[in-house]
Structures are given as structure tokens and as C-alpha cells.
């Protein structure tokens, strides 16, 4: 996946700090305060979307050929720029008891960008 | 201490109008959801839906989808629930609840409650 | 939208004894995201238990709850005088939000 480099406008991984505190999540998340969040963005042209190394799934790759033929159903349909690769990152935080919970939290670091 | 202040009882005729409110204090009031909970005497807990206070994102149960309405004050710390064309059958006591809806993170239970409303609508 | 039943309706049991109330889904509830609520005549719902299985503040230790997927059970080890009330399952696993329809424990 891409990292965002500002010099070109294909999908990509966007830098991007979430603290807690802007979202008013500050008085139950315990730590960390914040996270590299990170975001997808850009264009899926179906040159990109087409190949295997920027497509989400093996799935995507066959679809996309169909649809740079122009082939029905397929061929109004968009290639998104989403999250291929997510990470799980650790917080301790309340429960709805108040009690301090120390969890894996699932999918909360996107670590690469693909088009769908 | 944690507190949800409900305002107080109503009597209405059939096709009008109620919004009863919810007073939040002793928390952060946009870290939660409040959701309205009804219950019609001597029967169970209906879910009405749900507002989230940080955004004002609203989730209504479908059978008061159009009649039902939904609001917050951040400024007071205040939810509304405004129901309309008002039934004989919408007579019930209504409770606001909070809840953190972060399924991610295990949270969505309704931890504190109004103290209710009655609502009548008798012609 | 997952609809709960509870059973038995109505428990009449004596101060003392074990009730064992049960609530089962019309389909999986997601990680065990099951409340258990008491309610009292003129007063608001109060959780006793959340996540199926963890005890809210300040539960008395005799309220337990378990149970995972589509069957659940709350099992009062002792009855208290005050524990007699009506009891609400609720799954917050998916919108719309449902409780299920109640048990009474009643006084013998």
C-alpha cells in the first residue's frame, strides 16, 4: 500500500492523529490519549484497481478486469479507496460496570490502503 | 453523582404532540448515547431508539419511524423525545437511559436511568 | 431484529431459595452483549449485569449471570426480600435494541 506523499492523488495511506479528548472520549479511555488512526484516500483508476498489489481482494482484481471491458454489470461501478490491512492496538479503559478493562480493540489502525 | 432528570407527567388528547426531556449531570453528556425506553402500565420494556449526544445521530425503532423525533441540547446537557399523532395505545411511561453503543470495545449497556414519565392520551 | 424470550413468566419461589430465570434469542447475540435488568412497581430499570456475564455497580455477589450465543440465564443463588421484582433480558448486540418480554419472581 501507498503511503500519501502529496505528489500524487492514487489511493493511499493519510496520516491521521485521532486524541480521544477532541471526540469526548477522554473520561473513559484511560490510555493511551490518542492513536495513529490513519485514513485511506485517493483515486482508483482502473489501471490501479485492476492490479493485484493496490486491490483488496483476489475478488476485486477479477471484477475490476470485467469492468476495464466495459462488461455488464460492471461497467458503471467505481473502485473505492479503502483500508486493506487494519491493526488491533491495546487500551484500558471503563466498562459499563467502571470497572478497568485492558483490551485488544480490533481494526482501530488502518496500516494499508487498496482499492475495492 | 451520575443523574438523568426527567421531566414530568402529561396528559394529551389523541393526534397531538409530547416532548418529554431528559437532564443529564454528574457526567460528560456527549460521551453517551441516550436512548428512550417506553413501558405501557403492566406491560414490558420497548425500545424507542436512540440519540448520540456528541453528533446527533439518531436510530428509531421502526414502528415510530416519522412520528417519533429525537434531539439534544449540548448546552444543557438536555434530550428531547418528541412523539406525534399521539394514540391511545402511546399511553405509557417513558424513561431515558445512557449507554456508550462502542460494540468494539464490549460498551452498550443502559447503566443509569430517568426516573420516568408518564404520558396519558385519553380523549 | 433478534427477539428475546424469556421463561418462565412468573417464578414463585420462597426468601432463601435459587431462581433461575432464562432468556434465549432468535439468533446469536455478538459477544455476549446481554443485560440483565431488575425492575421494581413505580421505579426505573436497574442493570444488574452486562456482557452476560459481569456484575454492574454495585450488584450484590448472589446475582450471577452466564450463558453465551442464543441462551442466557440469570441465577439469583439467595433469595433477599428485595430481590422480588421483575427481571428483563436485553441485547445490545444489534439495532433496533430489544428486551425480552419478563419474569416475575414473585413470593411464594
Known amino acids: 500500500g501507498l503511503e500519501c506523499d502529496g505528489k500524487v492523488n492514487i489511493c493511499c495511506k493519510k496520516q491521521f492523529f485521532v486524541s480521544f479528548k477532541d471526540i469526548g472520549w477522554n473520561d473513559w479511555i484511560i490510555a493511551p490519549s490518542g492513536y495513529h488512526a490513519n485514513y485511506c484516500e485517493g483515486e482508483c483508476p482502473s489501471h490501479i484497481a485492476g492490479t493485484s498489489g493496490s486491490s483488496l481482494s483476489f475478488h476485486s482484481t477479477v471484477i475490476n478486469h470485467y469492468r476495464m471491458r466495459g462488461h455488464s454489470p460492471f461497467a458503471n461501478l467505481k473502485s473505492c479507496c479503502v483500508p486493506t490491512k487494519l491493526r488491533p492496538m491495546s487500551m484500558l479503559y471503563y466498562d459499563d460496570g467502571q470497572n478497568i478493562i485492558k483490551k485488544d480493540i480490533q481494526n482501530m489502525i488502518v496500516e494499508e490502503c487498496g482499492c475495492s | 453523582q451520575v443523574q438523568l432528570v426527567q421531566s414530568g407527567a402529561e396528559v394529551k388528547k389523541p393526534g397531538a404532540s409530547v416532548k418529554v426531556s431528559c437532564k443529564a449531570s454528574g457526567y460528560t453528556f456527549t460521551s453517551y448515547y441516550i436512548h428512550w425506553v417506553r413501558q405501557a402500565p403492566g406491560q414490558g420494556l420497548e425500545w424507542m431508539g436512540a440519540i448520540y449526544a456528541y453528533s446527533g445521530d439518531t436510530n428509531y425503532a421502526q414502528k415510530l419511524q416519522g412520528r417519533v423525533t429525537m434531539t439534544t441540547d449540548t448546552s444543557t446537557s438536555t434530550a428531547y423525545m418528541e412523539l406525534r399523532s399521539l394514540r391511545s395505545d402511546d399511553t405509557a411511561v417513558y424513561y431515558c437511559?445512557?449507554?456508550?453503543?462502542?460494540?468494539?470495545?464490549?460498551?452498550?449497556?443502559?447503566?443509569?436511568w430517568g426516573q420516568g414519565t408518564l404520558v396519558t392520551v385519553s380523549s | 431484529e433478534i427477539v428475546l424470550t424469556q421463561s418462565p413468566g412468573t417464578l414463585s419461589l420462597s426468601p432463601g431459595e435459587r431462581a433461575t430465570l432464562s432468556c434465549r434469542a432468535s439468533?446469536?447475540?455478538?459477544?455476549?452483549?446481554l443485560a440483565w435488568y431488575q425492575q421494581k412497581p413505580g421505579q426505573a430499570p436497574r442493570l444488574l449485569i452486562y456482557g452476560a456475564s459481569s456484575r454492574a455497580t454495585g450488584i450484590p455477589d448472589r446475582f450471577s449471570g452466564s450463558g453465551s450465543g442464543t441462551d442466557f440465564t440469570l441465577t439469583i443463588s439467595r433469595l433477599e426480600p428485595e430481590d422480588f421484582a421483575v427481571y428483563y433480558c436485553?441485547?445490545?448486540?444489534?439495532?433496533?435494541?430489544?428486551f425480552g418480554g419478563g419474569t416475575k419472581v414473585e413470593i411464594k
Open positions: 437511559a445512557r449507554a456508550r453503543d462502542i460494540a468494539a470495545a464490549g460498551l452498550g449497556a443502559f447503566d443509569y
Open positions: 436485553q441485547q445490545y448486540s444489534n439495532y433496533p435494541r430489544t
Open positions: 439468533q446469536s447475540v455478538r459477544s455476549s452483549y
